[in-house]
């Protein structure tokens, strides 16, 4: 058993039919010795009475809030949660697999730039009763600062029959250093509580590998005389680290026609102009990538050919 | 070029040759993010190479100020991996074939090197580990990894290199 | 075609050593690696230890301590397997075989014993 | 060192029935989680072995009725209809540690 939060303790529990389950004493905050008595949740039922209770936390139906009384006034609280450790493995009930880039993968992070800020989302089929708190560090065995602020329900879906909710968070590193080489990992740690069961998550890695920079920004066509090809130009997205002499991206043009079985034409560039044939009805569409590392390339920005 | 007393590297011919080392160096292992390098009995194994760090005055502030430092620190790098590349854990087995991209890449690290390094002048280099793994299969994970790291120092080499050719080329 | 030509049967006395030759032809010697596997009358096979020529390593099987020799003649395209203190558990068909041992992008880890010798027995008994 | 324990250690199977041979070994044989450092020889009678599976593909020439599968410590190799030339010794063997190590093999009879 250990704290996770004031008055909030996690049982871990080897999870498999008849399990012994786990002891635990509890002991009420309160400097009273004597008439002190017990109860769980919303129910009158006396547990037992005394400064301490000593209980066998086997299932759900152990969990839940205990609170000691004197009296009819309420002394303290103690929330237990219960996680649960199937053959040797932490239960993943709360979260969605998302499988990308791996199976396993419950949580996604991405940045835009190296200034050291990244976002990072995480899905459940989970809609009540359900909280998240977000740690962050770089390094583990002697961790430097990162902030993170409060999950927030970011999108809702529906999948087949039922609804998908995707929480997500946004968190800083203290003090980023957006030119030096990372040598150690970035550590992300999502404790999850749905009712009374409680599951952490964690996802490591360097912010080189999860930038993905946002579209080019400013996309514009300019016809070159008595040709069918025009000029396109566009700029760096705003988002993107500066300066650009140092922080350049690498780019990828792309002519598509209407049907999405027509053979796309693709330029690579590391200049923000390049010269297309532009075919009636057709699509000009530019994604960046980082032009020194292959991390994740933009999204499309599009313009139409006409 | 960079000798230790001051005078600039060719930064054009860096910044060129630094970005074909991002391309070897990406063409020697594309996969290498989507392997499971969590293997049983896997130390952290590429703790010792040198890092690009926050003080070595690589960012562009740092290369205003003073380009040496910063580049006594890529040529320090460049050193390491160019020996690690010729070392046993890429020379022994599972032997690369003959046209893999780890043989330019070797050649390359140690081309831009000298870019950066006329002989007669020395900068002092770093110590290489002695890495020599027992077994094929962690010669085959420290290629991985060591790989894994030269792609994020070459990132950076090449950051400065084309900084410097669009900044500070005379 | 590939071949792979073993010297040829020896009768050899408790305590005495045995030296294994391996021939190679039909491609270059020094791109492949040569592995020694041997079988006892009715058994399974074992593997003794590989030699590879371009890179100068040598693989053992611990278990032969120290008795088992690998080596390999470029000039002449031939490996050697020497066996010392032989004792009469090691009368066996001692096999060579090319190992082809590589990794690339796509296959980080290819290995095979593609080509084997005819085998030579070696008997030990006093 | 890595025990490859092989089962069973005899099959006579009809001529067209399947055959299932497994290996077994003492630690995960599996690379980066995926790649496969286990592979499968036949040996007949008076020759030496012959690699018929590498990791998890046929060498080129073994007819398709050969199928290998497994990873991590479990592995099998599958004769979907057994023919009268595939009688022989059937032997996996490790290559991801040092010493390498064949099963104790499986022989294959017609019944």
């Known amino acids: 058993i250990w704290e996770l939060k004031k008055d909030v303790y996690v049982v871990e529990l080897d999870w498999y039919p008849d399990a012994p389950g786990e002891m635990v004493v509890l002991t009420c905050d309160t400097p009273e010795e004597d008439g002190i008595t017990w109860t769980l949740d919303q129910s009158s039922e006396v547990l037992g009475s005394g400064k301490t209770l000593t209980i066998q936390v086997k299932e759900f139906g152990d969990a839940g809030q205990y609170t000691c009384h004197k009296g009819g006034e309420v002394l303290s609280h103690s929330l237990l949660l219960l996680h649960k450790k199937e053959d040797g493995i932490w239960s993943t009930d709360i979260l969605k697999d998302q499988k990308e880039p791996k199976n396993k993968t419950f949580l996604r992070c991405e940045a835009k730039n190296y200034s050291g800020r990244f976002t990072c989302w995480w899905l459940t089929t989970i809609s009540t009763d359900l909280t998240f708190s977000v740690k962050s560090s770089r390094g583990s065995s002697d961790p430097q600062g990162v902030t993170c602020g409060a999950a927030t329900l970011s999108a809702e879906r529906v999948r087949g029959d039922n609804k998908e909710y995707e929480y997500s968070v946004e968190c800083q590193e203290d003090s980023a250093c957006p030119a030096a080489e990372e040598s150690l990992p970035i550590e992300v740690m999502v404790d999850a509580v749905h009712k009374l069961k409680y599951e952490n998550y964690t996802s490591s890695f360097f912010i080189r590998d999860i930038i993905k920079p946002d579209p080019p920004k400013n996309l514009q066509l300019k016809p070159l005389k008595n040709s069918r090809q025009v000029e396109v130009s566009w700029e760096y997205p705003d988002t993107w680290s500066t300066p650009h002499s140092y922080f350049s991206l690498t780019f990828c043009v792309q002519v598509q026609g209407k049907s999405k079985r027509e053979k796309k034409d693709r330029v690579f560039t590391d200049k923000t102009s390049a010269t297309v044939i532009c075919r009636k009805n057709a699509s000009i569409s530019v994604r960046a990538q980082d032009r020194y590392y292959s991390s994740s390339w933009s999204e499309w920005a599009s313009v139409p050919c006409s | 070029r960079a000798v230790p007393g001051g005078s600039s590297p060719a930064w054009t011919q860096c910044q060129q040759l630094s970005q074909k080392l991002c391309t070897l160096a990406w063409s020697a292992h594309p996969l290498v993010g989507h392997m499971d390098l969590r293997e049983e009995g896997d130390e952290e194994t590429t703790n010792d190479v040198p890092h690009i760090q926050c003080g070595d005055g690589c960012d562009p502030q740092g290369l205003r100020d003073n380009s040496q430092f910063c580049l006594q620190r890529i040529h320090q790098g460049l050193i390491f991996y160019e020996k690690l590349l010729g070392s046993d854990i890429f020379t022994g087995e599972p032997s690369l074939l003959p046209d893999s991209p780890v043989g330019q890449l070797h050649a390359s690290l140690l081309g831009l090197s000298q870019l950066l390094q006329p002989e007669g002048h020395h900068w002092e280099t770093q110590q290489i580990p002695s890495l020599s793994p027992s077994q094929p299969w962690q010669r085959l994970l420290l290629r991985f990894k060591i790989l894994r790291s030269l792609q994020a120092f070459v990132a950076v080499a090449a950051r400065v290199f084309a900084h410097g050719a669009a900044t500070l080329s005379p | 075609q590939v071949q792979l030509v073993q010297s040829g049967a020896e009768v050899k006395k408790p305590g005495s050593s045995v030296k294994v030759s391996c021939k190679a032809s039909?491609?270059?010697?020094?791109?492949?690696?040569i592995t020694w596997v041997r079988q006892a009358p009715g058994q399974g096979l074992e593997w003794m230890g590989e030699?590879?020529?371009?890179?100068?390593?040598?693989y053992y099987n611990e278990k032969f301590k120290g008795r088992v020799t690998i080596t390999a003649d470029k000039s002449t395209s031939t490996a050697y397997m020497e066996l010392s203190s032989l004792r009469s558990e090691d009368t066996a068909v001692y096999y060579c075989?090319?190992?082809?041992?590589?990794?690339?992008?796509?296959?980080?880890?290819?290995?095979?014993?593609?080509?084997w010798g005819q085998g030579t027995l070696v008997t030990v008994s006093s | 060192d890595i025990v490859m324990t092989q089962s069973p250690d005899s099959l006579a199977v009809s001529l067209g029935e399947r055959a299932t041979i497994n290996c077994k070994a003492s630690?995960?044989?599996?690379?980066?989680?995926?790649?496969?450092?286990l592979h499968w020889y036949q040996q007949k009678p008076g020759q030496p072995p012959k690699l018929i599976y590498n990791?998890?593909k046929p060498e080129s020439g073994v007819p398709d009725r050969f199928s290998g599968s497994g990873s991590g410590t479990d592995f099998t190799l599958t004769i979907s209809s057994l023919q009268a030339e595939d009688v022989a010794v059937y032997y996996c063997?490790?290559?991801?540690?040092?010493?390498?190590?064949f099963g104790g093999g499986t022989k294959v009879e017609i019944k």
């Open positions: 075989a090319r190992a082809e041992f590589i990794s690339t992008v796509v296959a980080p880890y290819y290995y095979a014993l593609d080509y």
């Open positions: 039909g491609y270059t010697f020094a791109s492949y690696g």
């Open positions: 030699n590879y020529p371009r890179s100068g390593n040598t």
């Open positions: 630690k995960k044989v599996t690379i980066f989680g995926s790649t496969s450092a």
């Open positions: 990791g998890a």
């Open positions: 063997l490790q290559n991801k540690e040092v010493p390498y190590t």
